[in-house]
């Protein structure tokens, strides 16, 4: 959570300065048009002002920058590059600003940027080099430790002819720049699957939020290398069962808390291992709330209350006995 300041300590620019662009470096106490600034809190807020581009005259002291609720559309390369650079900028919130394109190097020249929130932008075009800044196979490490990408999926008719999951993952993995990332939020993005290599290349993750997606299975996902992972949010997906390999990997993580609420668990013979695990594990939070969705006869049964006799699979009839 980024620090903010009370409104009374903010200075506002006069509206008539809206189109002014300073050719000189900004004065230390200058505040961009349509923004509120607090030098004491090192915070600039340009919120719900329908801005179409990032203000050029941001004060050099800015540590927390809120550019939410605008109409930025495109974030070009070097969108925050300034002379002198915004060396203090640590937290940048661009949520809900109608961004549909983030270009390569959009966040270059921000040496202290630790938190970035791009949530609630329909990102049809997220460059693979948006966060790494270059197309080198190994880029300079990004200072980012927290990347919030909740609800960045564009409407279906605006998506490029490629996998949205693939586009996001390419940006996360480019140049191995995000090796220091500790928090990654990817909630509400209609993800159908998680590419198997993504987690292996983000070894510092402490918090991973994949809630409210459409994940059906974790069979090909490995959590083994995420030895620092503290919370894994998988609520509100389409998970049917967790298999032994996944259960063992989760159980072995030293700091983990797992959230599994509101998935359509299929309570048939394939669920037996997971039920056995749930009865003994302490890593699943609120495990007593997990219920079956299928088959119909099992709907709303609590997983923790099931025994092996409840978990059967209908026998597959030989073709000669099958009826049409």
């Amino acid at each position: 959570s980024s620090p903010t300041s009370s409104a009374s300590s903010f200075s506002s620019s006069a509206p008539f300065l809206a189109s002014a662009v300073s050719a000189q470096p900004p004065l230390p106490d200058q505040c961009p048009a349509l923004c509120e600034c607090s030098e004491a809190a090192r915070t600039v807020k340009c919120v719900n002002r329908n801005l179409t581009e990032v203000p050029t005259d941001l004060p050099a002291y800015v540590r927390n920058l809120f550019l939410t609720g605008n109409q930025l559309a495109v974030l070009p390369a070097g969108a925050f590059a300034r002379r002198p650079p915004l060396a203090e900028l640590a937290a940048l919130n661009l949520s809900g600003s109608r961004l549909d394109e983030v270009r390569a190097g959009a966040f270059e020249h921000l040496p202290s940027l630790r938190q970035l929130d791009l949530s609630h932008n329909p990102l049809a075009d997220l460059s693979p080099f948006a966060f790494s800044g270059s197309n080198a196979s190994v880029s300079a490490p990004s200072p980012l430790v927290e990347l919030i990408l909740n609800h960045i999926v564009p409407p279906e008719d605006e998506r490029q002819n490629r996998s949205f999951e693939g586009m996001v993952v390419a940006a996360l993995l480019a140049g191995r720049a995000l090796q220091g990332l500790r928090r990654l939020e990817l909630a509400s993005n209609h993800f159908l699957y998680l590419p198997r290599d993504v987690l292996a290349q983000l070894p510092s993750l402490r918090h991973l939020d994949l809630s409210n997606n459409s994940l059906v299975s974790l069979t090909y996902v490995s959590f083994r290398n995420l030895t620092h992972l503290e919370s894994l949010h998988l609520e509100d997906n389409a998970l049917k069962v967790l298999h032994n390999g996944t259960l063992a990997e989760l159980q072995g993580l030293p700091h983990i808390r797992v959230f599994l609420d509101n998935n359509p668990w299929v309570c048939d013979c394939h669920m037996a291992d997971m039920v056995t695990w749930l009865k003994e594990t302490e890593v699943v939070q609120g495990k007593d709330r997990l219920t079956c969705a299928y088959p119909e006869k099992m709907r709303n049964r609590v997983l923790l209350e099931l025994n092996s006799a409840d978990l059967d699979c209908d026998p597959i009839l030989p073709p000669s006995l099958q009826t049409s």
Epitope: E230, N244, L247, A248, Q251, G252, L253, P254, H255, I256, R257, F259, W277, E280, T281, E282, V283, Q285, G286, K287, D288
Partner: antibody, heavy 122, light 111 residues
Framework: EVQLVESGGGLIQPGGSLRLSCAAS????????MSWVRQPPGKGLEWVGF??????????ENSASVKGRFTISRDNSKSTLYLQMNSLRAEDTAVYYC?????????????WGQGTLVTVSS | DIVLTQSPLSLPVTPGEPASISCRAS??????????LQWYLQKPGQSPQLLIY???NVESGVPDRFSGSGSGTDFTLKISRVEAEDIGVYFC?????????FGGGTKVEIK
């Protein structure tokens, strides 16, 4: 920096009651299971019980030797763990340690307090 | 309850020499591929400090001369080269099942 500081120990008569406190700091208290472990003078360690975290409803588990007599609770607004000890016996004499369970509680306790001595004697 | 038996009860050591302590469980402490067995050191007048968790993971800040091995029911704590500061009582603990239980302890002292 994680810190656990116990208090409330002392001399108490058999059959009496005592409440131990453990003030926690340096971590998000509600995320963690917390426990009490005791050590009679010159002896080994004995697990007393634990209380689960917010995600698991702050439910408790106790060892058989204290069940029905000792109650573990927590005040999350004060980041404090408690051990209410009733019907105390001579064999409850021990140093009582408060300890934090690791994020995955199956890996047991990673931080311990300095302990508080409870002596049950007439 | 799972009973943990430690041996030896007492271990006189020479600084610079290796040392080894055994812990045997009355039943397996493994659960989904991980053995939930910890080792603690209690130095004189201090509270216990975690050395090893999950049978073989060395806790952050613990010198790398300490190592743990084993699975199922048989576990070993090794000190590659004992130092004077390593004296104290070593306890193993299982957290596979409630109630969690501790071994009786091994007292390590300088010869």
């Amino acid at each position: 920096e994680v810190q656990l500081v116990e208090s409330g120990g002392g001399l108490i008569q058999p059959g009496g009651s005592l409440r131990l406190s453990c003030a926690a700091s340096g971590f998000t208290f509600t995320d963690y299971y917390m426990s009490w472990v005791r050590q009679p003078p010159g002896k080994g360690l004995e697990w007393v019980g634990f209380i689960r975290n917010k995600g698991n409803g702050y439910t408790t588990e106790n060892s058989a030797s204290v069940k029905g007599r000792f109650t573990i609770s927590r005040d999350n607004s004060k980041s404090t763990l408690y051990l209410q000890m009733n019907s105390l016996r001579a064999e409850d004499t021990a140093v009582y340690y408060c300890a934090r369970y690791r994020g995955n509680p199956h890996y047991a306790m990673d931080y311990w307090g300095q302990g508080t001595l409870v002596t049950v004697s007439s | 309850d799972i009973v943990l038996t430690q041996s030896p009860l007492s271990l006189p050591v020479t600084p610079g020499e290796p040392a080894s302590i055994s812990c045997r469980a009355s039943e397996s402490v493994e659960f989904y591929g991980t053995s939930f067995l910890q080792w603690y050191l209690q130095k004189p007048g201090q509270s216990p400090q975690l050395l090893i968790y999950g049978a073989s993971n060395v806790e952050s800040g613990v010198p790398d001369r300490f190592s743990g091995s084993g699975s199922g029911t048989d576990f070993t704590l090794k000190i590659s080269r004992v130092e004077a500061e390593d004296i104290g009582v070593y306890f193993c603990q299982q957290s596979r099942k409630v109630p969690s239980t501790f071994g009786g302890g091994t007292k390590v002292e300088i010869k």
